[in-house]
């Protein structure tokens, strides 16, 4: 907290410029008008203020906007955003995707901080759902974003937004998350033809039920082993040897290398040895 002191004669700031870097903390407090700061926030980032000086500028904005900053100020916070606490951010009402992008840019290259997580949460809740443009933006900055959401949060993702999801965005999703996302993807891609559909749905198959896997096995999709290994164990177990052979196509030989791993291990144990022998891979049930 900076003490209230009178501004020395001739030091009253008329605009936000580089001369302010020579001001002591108490001088910034006394000589910079908060309303001026708010209207010229876009200049702050071009000036090499110290962390201590930024603290003073934040304090001035906090005093001017005790109920939370307006979006016109938020959009131009720049590096001052790093000074904000989650509690500060919870007071904001961010509606513009451009504002969101501007603040995410400040944190670019770093892991998602509590501040960023709170900002995103406020933004998405304000919009009511995770639309395609928002998802595009968030996954561009944080490829793991989608998988950081709870199944409950994912349920608000409309199927149309699924088009924005890239395979790498799903790398860290767990089964419960894929259970929510798979039906949305199935709906989003339903009008595509066989081979194109499989390319799009492949990353989501960790949430697919047995009947969908059986259907895919009839379409010559040649699923790779990496995808097969991510399928739900309970979805794989009812598949027959013939169905797995059709599903994997030429990749069926890869089962041998994965015979000690789930879900392959569980599936092998549930097959008749005679059926396994037809694969010619030496798999033992």
């Amino acid at each position: 907290e900076v003490e209230k002191t009178a501004c020395p004669s001739g030091k009253k700031a008329r605009e936000i410029d580089e001369s302010l870097i020579f001001y002591k903390k108490w001088e910034l407090e006394a000589c910079v008008d908060a309303a001026l700061l708010a209207t010229q926030m876009d200049r702050v980032n071009a000036i090499p203020f110290t962390y201590e000086q930024l603290d003073v500028l934040k304090h001035k904005l906090d005093e001017l906007y005790p109920q939370g900053y307006p979006e016109s100020v938020i959009q131009h916070l720049g590096y001052l955003f790093l000074k904000m606490s989650p509690e500060d951010i919870r007071k904001w009402n961010v509606t513009s995707l451009e504002t969101l992008k501007a603040l995410l840019e400040v944190n670019k290259g770093h892991e998602m901080s509590p501040q960023v997580a709170t900002l995103i949460d406020r933004f998405v809740k304000g919009r009511g759902q995770l639309d395609k443009d928002t998802l595009d933006t968030l996954t561009a900055f944080y490829p793991g974003y989608l998988c950081s959401l709870s199944p409950e949060e994912l349920s608000s993702v409309p199927p149309s937004s699924i088009w924005a999801v890239r395979p790498q965005d799903l790398d860290t999703c767990d089964p419960r998350q894929l259970d929510v996302l798979y039906p949305k993807a199935r709906l989003a891609f339903q009008n595509m033809n066989g081979s194109e559909y499989f390319v799009k749905i492949q990353s989501f198959l960790g949430g697919a039920p047995t009947e969908d896997l059986k259907a895919l096995s009839q379409q010559n999709v040649s699923m790779d082993l990496a995808t097969f290994m991510k399928l739900r164990t309970d979805a794989v177990l009812p598949l027959t040897v013939a169905e797995v052979q059709k599903l994997l196509g030429p990749h069926v030989e890869g089962l041998k290398a994965e015979e000690r791993h789930r879900p392959v291990r569980d599936w092998i144990l549930r097959q008749r040895q005679d059926d396994l022998d037809t694969l010619g891979l030496g798999l033992q049930g």
């Epitope: 767990d174 089964p175 419960r176 998350q177 290994m229 991510k230 164990t233 309970d234 177990l237 000690r260 791993h261 789930r262 291990r265 144990l269 549930r270 049930g285």
Partner: antibody, heavy 119, light 107 residues
């Protein structure tokens, strides 16, 4: 509900064979949905998986114990058993039997039985 | 064998604290990761299976997350009955392995 109960001698001499039985009540070892495992815990230490058996008789053992372990199932008695040969003091532990469900986790455990290897 | 490394090995916390325990696998185990709680003289109790699914009857203050090699068990608000030792376990590879355990003690 399903319950597991370990039984067997609490004291075994070095170089002899440790034999334990797990009796399943309220469920069947013949169910194709489960694996039946043995797990042990030396005093003051962590958990070590020993091996499992499937109702069909298929077994899978911890590689570090494989040469000394045999797990068998008796569906008529609704039991599965553990035999560990050539025991030493290092085999002194609480031995648990456990059921592994479809989710790949040990969802039901016996209360454990302490086995001491000493002459 | 797949090695499971838990951290920390022990921690002191107070009732109401948020507690996080991590488990790292030496290679990818997909989501085949389970968490158990064990109290002295008792058998372990399953808390979380398949990385994030809460076992029936387990309080919702327990949650799990992660996939691949890095996993987390979180207790959102520690209760007196939660002071115990926690173990992670992988069931992806046929040779199951447990983490070394994390003892949660009263501060």
């Amino acid at each position: 509900q399903v319950q597991l109960q370990e039984s067997g001698p609490g004291l075994v001499k070095p170089s002899e064979t440790l034999s334990l039985t797990c009796t399943v009540s309220g469920g069947s070892v013949s169910s194709g949905s489960y694996y039946w495992s043995w797990i042990r815990q030396p005093p003051g230490k962590g958990l070590e998986w020993i091996g499992y058996i499937y109702y069909s008789g298929s077994t899978n053992y911890n590689p570090s114990l494989k040469s000394r372990v045999t797990i068998s199932v008796d569906t008529s008695k609704n039991q599965f058993s553990l035999k560990l040969s050539s025991v030493t003091a290092a085999d002194t532990a609480v031995y648990y039997c456990a059921r592994e469900g479809k989710n790949g986790a040990f969802d039901i455990w016996g209360q454990g039985t302490m086995v001491t290897v000493s002459s | 064998d797949i090695q499971m490394t838990q951290s920390p090995s022990s921690l002191s916390a107070s009732v109401g604290d948020r507690v996080t325990i991590t488990c790292r696998a030496s290679q990818s185990i997909s989501s085949y990761l389970n968490w158990y709680q064990q109290k002295p003289g008792k058998a372990p109790k399953l808390l979380i299976y398949a990385a994030s699914s809460l076992q029936s009857g387990v309080p919702s203050r327990f949650s799990g997350s992660g996939s691949g090699t890095d996993f987390t068990l979180t207790i959102s608000s520690l209760q007196p009955e939660d002071f115990a030792t926690y173990y992670c376990q992988q069931s992806y590879d046929a040779s199951y392995t447990f983490g070394g355990g994390t003892k949660v003690e009263i501060k």
